[in-house]
C-alpha cells in the first residue's frame, strides 16, 4: 500500500517495527515538502535480509524520474548496502521510499527506523543557469529567494533580471555625447531606453559612433536580441547591433530618436556617440574702426554670437544709442540679425555744477570727449576745497568726469571759517569797556529769535549764536528751551526759531539774511539747574549764502583743557534785555533799550580754580563745572548779559590764523552783569567738538586741520 | 542755598494798589520762570499764572487778567506782583514760587489785607 | 480748566500707621511728550508750601521715603507708610499738564 506523508518531518519504519517485518510485503512512503525544500533522510536503525544487489528484501529510496539509493542487509558490502550513517538528499520537493520483503524469511529481521525532514534549498548557491539565476543580487531565505539590483538599476517583472529606467533622456546643446547605460560596462538586460536629441530649428544633427560599439547579435537573424534604431521624423534607421559600427549619419533634421532595446540575457559592452548642430554659414564679419569683433573666427555658423566692442575712450553706437557692446548673431537662413555698429568717442558732456565754486577747461574748444581735462575750484575766500584737493577732472573712457582722489564725486566747496574780510583789532591793547563792531567783523555772528505765538500772549526772547557753516548754528541751550516746563528740558518748536544773519544794525535788516530753523537740537544733558551742558545747534530750513558779512567761526579741536587762563577773547551781542520789544521792533525799529549796534568786548580768561572759588564764596548753589571756562576782569566794568547768551567768545588762533569759537555765553550772576569779581560763565566749547560735528552729519576731519596748533 | 525772599505784609484801602516782590538767590535766576499762587484766609492754593524770567513774558489764569501784572528786574534778580484797583476779595496771602510748572521752591508769603 | 478732586478731605491719622490720599482729574495729565506733570505738596501750620514728589512718583530731595506717589491718567495716589507727628498739615495735588495749572481742594492730616 501507499501511504501519503506532507509533513516537514516525520518517522518511518517498517511494518510491525520493532519487531520482526512480515514476508511478502510492500508499503511506499510518498513524501511532498513545500518548494523551495529538499527531503532529508536517514536512518536510526537497519536490519534487513541480506541478498546480492539486494533482490529480496530491501528499502528504496527514490524520485519522480530517478532511484536515488537501494538499501538492505545488516552491513555494507560489495554487492550490497545499508544506509548507515548516511543521508539521503532529494533533489527536488518530493521523496518516494519503498520497503519490500519477499516471500520467505530464514531468520528474523528487525526492519528499519528512518527519519525524514524538510531542508531549506539555497538557491543562490545553487542556481548554475543564467535563465534562471539573479541578475545583479541573489537572497536566500528558508523556503526561498528573491533578487535584487544595483543602485540604479528596477527589477524586472520576471524578478531575475535588473534594468534601468532610461526613457527620458532629453538632450537639448549643440553638442553632447550618448552612451548605452553604464558604457563601458555591460548594459542592463531587459531594458527599453530612449534618447530625444531636440534642437532649435535650424540646425542639423549629425551622429557619429565612437569607441567600443559591442550590441548583441545573432549570425543569421539581423539583431533579434538587443539593438538601437534612430528614428528621424517617420524614417527608422536600423536596426543597428553585432562590433561593427554604424557609418557617421547626418540626420538632415533638429528633432532625432534614438531607441535602445535590450532583452533580459547577455553581457555586451554597449555604445557610444556623439552628436554636433549642423547650421548654414553666414558672411565674414569687419571690425568698426576702433573697435573689435569677439570671438574672432574663420567662419561663423547658425547660432553664433559675437560681441563688438570699442577701444578705451570709444562707445558703440547703434541707431544714435551709446552702449558699452553690442551682439550680433547669425540666423538661420545664412544672416546677420544686425549690421556693424560703429564706434564713437565718449564724450562726457558738460560738467556737473559745483556749489560755492567754477569750472576752468584745460582742453581747448572746451572739449568734453575722452581724455580731455577740467578743473574746478571754490569761490575764494569765502570757500575753500575739502581736503586741498586739485579740482582736476578727466572725461574717463566710462563718459563721466573722474577725479584721481574722489573719483566720479563732486569736490565739496567748505565755507572757510573764522576769517572776517576785515581784521579785527589788535589783541595788545586793553579795551575798559564795550565797542561798536564795524561790519564784517563778526561774519559769524547770529541774532535767534524766539516767539511762540502758540500761547497767549505770545511769547518772545532773543539770543545769539555763531555760524558754523552756510546751514547751522551753534548757541546756548538755555536760549533754546521753553522755560513753560522745569522738571524736563524741552526745546522750543522749530517753527518759533527765527535766525538773521549779516545784521550790524537792528534799525537796518535790509542787508541781513533771516532763515527759519529746520532743526532744534539741545545737548542731551542739558541740565537746567546749573547749566551744565549748555550748548545747542540751529539747521537753518536753507544754506545761507556766504560773503563778506556771512561767513562761519572755526570749531576749535577736541581738548578738555580749554582756551588757556589769561587769553584774551571777543564776544560780540546786541545785549537785548527788555523783554517788552516787538520782534518787528527789534529787527527794525532800533527802539533804545538795546543797542541798535553790534557790540562786542574783549575779555582774557579767568583760570579756573579762580573762578569757582569766587563762585562758592557766594551763597547759592552754583557750579563752574570741568564743561564751562569764565572770562571776565576782577574789577568787573565789562562782560557780556542776558541779551548776548549764545553768543560766540573767540580766541584768534595763531597758527591757523583763524578765529575759532572756544566759548558760548552761558550764565552769570548774581549780582549785575559787568559787577566786581562776577566772571561771565562759558560753555567750553571743545569738549563738545564730537557732539558738534555728529550733529552736523560731517566727518571731523572737515574743518579740524584748518585750526590746528 | 535755594532762597526767595518776599516783600512784608501790606494793608490797603479798596482802590489802591499794592506790589509785592520776590527776590531769588542760590541758582541761575533766568533758568527757572516764577510762579504766583494766591491763598485766600482758610482756603486753598490758587494759581495766579507765570512769568518767563528769560524773555519777561507773563502769562496769566483767567481769573486775574486785567488788574494784576507780573514784571521783573533781571539785575536784581527780582520779579513783582503787582494789584491795582484793590478790593476786599482779594485779601489773601500771595506766594511766588520757582518754576512755571514746577513750583519746587516757595516764598515764605505776603500777606495783602485790604480793609476800608 | 482741568478739575482736582482730593478724598478725603480730611484725615486722622495714628502714628505709625500709614495714610493714603487720592487725587483725581477731570482729564488725563499725560501730555503730548509722554510726562505727567501731577504733583504733591506739604502745607504745614503757619507755614508755606513745600512740595514732596513730582511728575507723579518723583521724590523731591530731602523728603523722607515713608512718602511714595502712583498712578496714571487721571488716579492719583499719595501714600504715607508710617506717618510721623512733623507730617500734620494740608496736602494739595496740582497739575502742571493743561493750562491754566489747578490745585486740588487740600486734605488736613492730623495726629490722633
Known amino acids: 500500500h501507499t501511504v501519503e506523508l506532507n509533513n516537514m518531518f516525520g518517522q518511518i519504519q517498517s511494518p510491525g517495527y520493532p519487531d520482526s517485518y512480515p514476508s511478502d510485503s510492500e508499503v511506499t512512503w510518498n513524501i511532498t515538502v513545500p518548494d523551495g525544500f529538499r527531503i532529508k533522510l536517514y536512518f536510526m536503525h537497519f536490519n534487513l535480509e541480506s541478498s546480492y544487489l539486494c533482490e529480496y528484501d530491501y528499502v528504496k529510496v527514490e524520485t519522480e524520474d530517478q532511484v536515488l539509493a537501494t538499501f538492505c542487509g545488516r552491513e555494507t558490502t560489495d554487492t550490497e548496502q545499508t544506509p548507515g550513517q548516511e543521508v539521503v538528499l532529494s533533489p527536488g520537493s518530493f521523496m518516494s521510499i519503498t520497503f519490500r520483503s519477499d516471500f520467505s524469511n530464514e531468520e528474523r529481521f528487525t526492519g528499519f527506523d528512518a527519519h525524514y525532514m524538510a531542508v531549506d534549498v539555497d538557491e543562490c548557491k545553487e542556481r548554475e543557469d543564467e535563465e534562471l539565476s539573479c541578475d545583479h543580487y541573489c537572497h536566500n531565505y528558508i523556503g526561498g529567494y528573491y533578487c535584487s539590483c544595483r543602485f540604479g538599476y528596477i527589477l524586472h517583472t520576471d524578478n531575475r533580471t535588473c534594468r534601468v529606467e532610461c526613457s527620458d533622456n532629453l538632450f537639448t546643446q549643440r553638442t553632447g555625447v550618448i552612451t548605452s547605460p553604464d558604457f563601458p560596462n555591460p548594459y542592463p538586460k531587459s531594458s527599453e531606453c530612449l534618447y530625444t536629441i531636440e534642437l532649435e530649428e535650424g540646425f542639423m544633427v549629425n551622429l557619429q559612433f565612437e569607441d567600443i560599439f559591442d550590441i548583441e547579435d545573432h549570425p543569421e537573424v539581423p539583431c533579434p536580441y538587443d539593438y538601437i534604431k534612430i528614428k528621424v521624423g517617420p524614417k527608422v534607421l536600423g536596426p543597428f547591433c553585432g562590433e561593427k559600427a554604424p557609418e557617421p549619419i547626418s540626420t538632415q533634421s533638429h528633432s532625432v530618436l534614438i531607441l535602445f532595446h535590450s532583452d533580459n540575457s547577455g553581457e555586451n559592452r554597449g555604445w557610444r556617440l556623439s552628436y554636433r548642430a549642423a547650421g548654414n554659414e553666414c558672411p565674414e564679419l569687419q571690425p568698426p574702426v576702433h573697435g573689435k569683433i569677439e570671438p574672432s573666427q574663420a567662419k561663423y555658423f547658425f547660432k553664433d554670437q559675437v560681441l563688438v566692442s570699442c577701444d578705451t575712450g570709444y562707445k558703440v553706437l547703434k541707431d544714435n544709442v551709446e552702449m558699452d557692446t553690442f551682439q550680433i548673431e547669425c540666423l538661420k537662413d545664412g544672416t546677420w540679425s544686425n549690421k556693424i555698429p560703429t564706434c564713437k568717442i565718449v564724450d562726457c558732456r558738460a560738467p556737473g555744477e559745483l556749489e560755492h565754486g567754477l569750472i576752468t577747461f584745460s582742453t581747448r574748444n572746451n572739449l568734453t570727449t575722452y581724455k580731455s581735462e577740467i578743473k574746478y575750484s571754490c569761490q575764494e575766500p569765502y570757500y575753500k576745497m575739502l581736503n586741498n584737493n586739485t579740482g582736476i577732472y578727466t572725461c574717463s573712457a566710462q563718459g563721466v568726469w573722474m577725479n584721481k582722489v574722489l573719483g566720479r564725486s563732486l569736490p565739496t566747496c567748505l565755507p572757510e571759517c573764522g576769517q572776517p574780510s576785515r581784521s579785527l583789532p589788535s589783541l595788545v591793547k586793553r579795551i575798559i569797556g564795550g565797542r561798536n563792531a564795524e561790519p564784517g567783523l563778526f561774519p559769524w555772528q547770529a541774532l535767534i529769535v524766539v516767539e511762540d505765538t502758540s500761547r497767549v500772549p505770545n511769547d518772545k526772547w532773543f539770543g545769539s549764536g555763531a555760524l558754523l557753516s552756510a546751514s547751522w548754528i551753534l548757541t546756548a541751550a538755555h536760549v533754546l528751551r521753553s522755560q513753560r516746563r522745569d522738571t524736563t528740558v524741552i526745546p522750543v518748536s522749530k517753527e518759533h526759531v527765527t535766525v538773521y544773519l549779516g545784521l550790524h544794525d537792528v534799525r537796518d535788516k535790509s542787508g541781513a539774511v533771516n532763515s527759519s530753523a529746520a532743526r532744534v537740537v539741545l545737548h542731551p544733558d542739558f541740565n537746567i539747574q546749573n547749566y551744565n551742558h549748555d550748548i545747542a545747534l540751529v539747521q537753518l530750513q536753507e544754506p545761507v549764502p556766504l560773503g563778506p558779512h556771512v561767513m562761519p567761526v572755526c570749531l576749535p579741536r577736541l581738548e578738555p583743557e580749554g582756551p588757556a587762563p589769561h587769553m584774551l577773547g571777543l564776544v560780540a551781542g546786541w545785549g537785548i534785555s527788555n523783554p517788552n520789544v516787538t520782534v518787528d521792533e527789534i529787527i527794525s525799529s532800533g527802539t533804545r533799550t538795546l543797542s541798535d549796534v553790534l557790540q562786542y568786548v574783549k575779555l582774557p580768561v579767568v583760570p579756573h580754580a579762580e573762578c569757582k572759588t569766587s563762585y562758592e564764596s557766594r551763597s547759592g548753589n552754583y557750579s563752574v563745572t570741568e564743561n564751562m571756562f569764565c572770562a571776565g576782569y576782577y574789577e568787573g566794568g565789562k562782560d557780556t548779559c542776558l541779551g548776548d547768551s549764545g553768543g560766540a567768545f573767540v580766541i584768534f588762533d595763531d597758527l591757523s590764523q583763524r578765529w575759532v569759537v572756544q566759548g558760548l555765553v552761558s550764565w552769570g550772576g548774581p549780582e549785575e552783569c559787568g559787577s566786581k569779581q562776577v566772571y561771565g560763565v562759558y560753555t567750553k566749547v571743545s569738549n563738545y567738538v564730537d557732539w558738534v560735528w555728529e550733529q552736523m552729519g560731517l566727518p571731523q576731519s572737515v574743518v579740524e586741520p584748518q585750526v590746528e596748533r | 542755598q535755594i532762597q526767595l525772599v518776599q516783600s512784608g505784609s501790606e494793608l490797603k484801602k479798596p482802590g489802591a494798589s499794592v506790589k509785592v516782590s520776590c527776590k531769588a538767590s542760590g541758582y541761575i535766576f533766568t533758568s527757572y520762570g516764577m510762579s504766583w499762587v494766591r491763598q485766600a484766609p482758610g482756603k486753598g492754593l490758587k494759581w495766579m499764572g507765570w512769568?518767563?524770567?528769560?524773555?519777561?513774558?507773563?502769562t496769566y489764569a483767567d481769573d486775574f487778567k486785567g488788574r494784576f501784572v507780573f514784571s521783573l528786574d533781571t539785575s536784581v534778580r527780582t520779579p513783582y506782583l503787582q494789584i491795582s484797583s484793590l478790593k476786599a476779595e482779594d485779601t489773601a496771602v500771595y506766594f511766588c514760587a520757582r518754576g512755571g510748572e514746577a513750583m519746587d521752591y516757595w516764598g515764605q508769603g505776603t500777606l495783602v489785607t485790604v480793609s476800608s | 480748566d482741568v478739575l482736582m478732586t482730593q478724598t478725603p478731605l480730611s484725615l486722622s491719622v495714628t502714628p505709625g500707621q500709614p495714610a493714603s490720599i487720592s487725587c483725581k482729574s477731570s482729564q488725563s495729565l499725560l501730555d503730548s511728550a509722554g510726562k505727567t506733570y501731577l504733583n504733591w505738596l506739604l502745607q504745614r501750620p503757619g507755614q508755606s508750601p513745600k512740595r514732596l514728589i513730582y511728575?507723579?512718583?518723583k521724590l523731591d530731595s530731602g523728603v523722607p521715603d515713608r512718602f511714595s506717589g502712583s498712578g496714571s491718567g487721571t488716579d492719583f495716589t499719595l501714600k504715607i507708610s508710617r506717618v510721623e507727628a512733623e507730617d500734620v498739615g494740608v496736602y494739595y495735588c496740582?497739575?502742571?499738564?493743561?493750562?491754566?495749572?489747578?490745585f486740588g481742594q487740600g486734605t488736613k492730616v492730623e495726629i490722633k
Open positions: 512769568i518767563n524770567t528769560y524773555s519777561g513774558v507773563p
Open positions: 496740582w497739575q502742571g499738564t493743561h493750562f491754566p495749572w489747578t
Open positions: 511728575l507723579v512718583s
